[in-house]
C-alpha cells in the first residue's frame, strides 16, 4: 500500500507494488512530485538552466561554482548542464594558502594584501586586486505547466506566463 513506499517510490495500481520513481538524466531535475507512494501524472524531468547543473537521479539542479566571484580563482572548465565548473589557479592579486585543510568550498584564494612577505603568487603584484564582484543573475526559468506545484526540493513554485 501507499504508506509502505519509500522516498523515491510510488504505488503502481496495476501491479499493486511500490515502483521506483523514474530517475532523471544528467543535466535534468525532477518536476512535480514522486515518492512516498504517489506520483503526479505530469511528473517528469526538466533541463537545468544555463547557470546550474545536475548529475541526474532525483538531484535538483545546483548552481555552478563561482570561481572568479567567490573563490577568486580562474575558470579551468566552465560548467554546463551536466557538470560543475572547475576552478584553476588564483586570479592575479590572489594566492592560495598552503597546507590549509580544504573547507566545504574547497580551496579559496586570498588577497595578496593579506599575504605574508615573499608569497610567490604575490611577488610583483601591485596594490592587490579590486573587489570586482560580478553581478549575480537569478534564474527566471518557469515550469512546463502553468499551475502551482511542489517540487522535490520542497519549494512551492507558481509558474505564470
Amino acid at each position: 500500500e501507499y504508506s509502505n513506499c519509500g522516498e523515491n517510490e510510488y504505488y503502481n495500481q496495476t501491479t499493486g507494488l511500490c515502483q521506483e520513481c523514474p530517475p532523471c538524466g544528467p543535466g535534468e531535475e525532477p518536476y512535480l512530485s514522486c515518492g512516498y507512494g504517489t506520483k503526479d501524472e505530469d511528473y517528469g524531468c526538466v533541463p537545468c538552466p544555463a547557470e546550474k547543473f545536475s548529475k541526474g537521479g532525483y538531484q535538483i539542479c545546483r548552481r555552478h561554482k563561482d570561481c572568479e566571484g567567490f573563490f577568486r580563482a580562474t575558470v579551468l572548465t566552465p560548467g554546463d548542464m551536466e557538470n560543475d565548473a572547475e576552478c584553476g589557479p588564483c586570479l592575479p592579486g590572489y594566492y592560495m594558502l598552503e597546507n590549509r585543510p580544504r573547507n566545504i568550498y574547497g580551496m579559496v584564494c586570498y588577497s595578496c594584501l593579506l599575504a605574508p612577505p615573499n608569497t610567490k603568487e604575490c611577488v610583483g603584484a601591485t596594490s592587490g586586486a579590486s573587489a570586482n564582484f560580478p553581478g549575480t543573475s537569478g534564474s527566471s526559468t518557469l515550469s512546463p505547466f502553468q499551475h502551482a506545484h511542489k517540487e522535490l526540493s520542497g519549494q512551492g513554485h507558481l509558474a505564470t506566463a
Epitope: P22, C24, G27, E28, Y31, E41, D42, Y43, G44, C45, V46, P47, C48, P49, A50, M81, S139, S140, T141, L142, S143, P144, F145, Q146, H147, A159, T160, A161
Partner: antibody, heavy 119, light 107 residues
C-alpha cells in the same frame, strides 16, 4: 504501423461542431500525456490542448478554451478533440502528438487531419 | 505568452553547406527549447530537445545550442533530405509556443 493516426476532419459550417479522433498503437498509450497541435494553411504550428496520462490534468490555449474539449479513452487507446462553435480561423491541419514519458516535448506526431470551416 | 521568433523565414543553401537557424524567446526559457522538422508532405519529427540533446534516430549532423533567450539549430553538412521547414518550440511554460518556422531550400 503508424503510432498515431488522426481522423474526423472535413468541411464544417461556421458555428458547427466536429469531433476528431487519434488512434494510438505500438506503445503504452495510458503512460503518455497527449497533445493536439494545429497548423493553419501556410502558417506555423500552434499548440492547442494537452491531457495527462490519466486525464487528471487538462490544459488549453486561450484561442480554443471554452470551445474545444480534449479527452481520452485509455481502454481504446484513443485521444479525442471535441470542437464546437467553430470559426473560419479554426481551419487547419490538426495533429495529435505524444508527450515523451518523462520530458516535456512532442516526441511522436500523427500525419494530421484537415478541418475546413466555411459556409 | 512567450513569443518565439525565427527571424529568417526562408533560407537557401547548397548541399554540403553548414546551415544555422536561429530562434529567440521573448523571455528566458531556461533550456526548455525543442526543434522540429516538417517535411513538405506535412510530416513532423522531433530533432533536438532541451536545447542540445539529439532525439534518437536523428543524424549527428544536427546539433543545437543556446541558453536564456537565444537558441540555434545547426546542420553541419546539408543533405537533400534536410529540405524542410524547421520550427523551434518552448516548453518552459504554458501555452507552449512555436516559432514561425524557417523554410530551408536548395540553391
Amino acid at each position: 504501423e503508424v503510432p498515431l493516426e488522426e481522423s474526423g476532419g472535413g468541411l464544417v459550417k461556421p458555428g458547427g461542431s466536429r469531433k476528431l479522433s487519434c488512434a494510438a498503437s505500438g506503445f503504452t498509450f495510458s503512460d503518455h500525456g497527449m497533445h493536439w497541435v494545429r497548423q493553419a494553411p501556410e502558417k506555423g504550428l500552434e499548440w492547442i490542448a494537452y491531457i495527462s496520462s490519466g486525464s487528471s490534468n487538462v490544459y488549453y490555449s486561450d484561442t480554443v478554451k471554452g470551445r474545444f474539449t480534449i479527452s481520452r479513452d485509455n481502454a481504446k487507446n484513443t485521444l479525442f478533440l471535441q470542437m464546437t462553435s467553430l470559426r473560419s480561423e479554426d481551419t487547419a491541419m490538426y495533429y495529435c502528438a505524444r508527450r515523451e514519458l518523462l520530458r516535456f516535448y512532442f516526441d511522436v506526431w500523427g500525419q494530421g487531419t484537415s478541418v475546413t470551416v466555411s459556409s | 505568452d512567450i513569443q518565439m521568433t525565427q527571424t529568417t523565414s526562408s533560407l537557401s543553401a547548397s548541399l554540403g553547406d553548414r546551415v544555422t537557424i536561429s530562434c529567440r524567446a521573448s523571455q528566458d526559457i531556461g533550456n526548455h527549447l525543442n526543434w522540429y522538422q516538417q517535411k513538405p508532405d506535412g510530416t513532423v519529427k522531433l530533432l533536438i530537445y532541451y536545447t542540445s540533446r539529439i532525439h534518437s534516430g536523428v543524424p549527428s549532423r544536427f546539433s543545437g545550442s543556446g541558453s536564456g533567450t537565444d537558441y540555434s539549430l545547426t546542420i553541419s553538412n546539408l543533405e537533400q533530405e534536410d529540405i524542410a521547414t524547421y520550427f523551434c518550440q518552448q516548453g518552459n511554460t504554458l501555452p507552449w509556443t512555436f516559432g514561425g518556422g524557417t523554410k530551408l531550400e536548395i540553391k
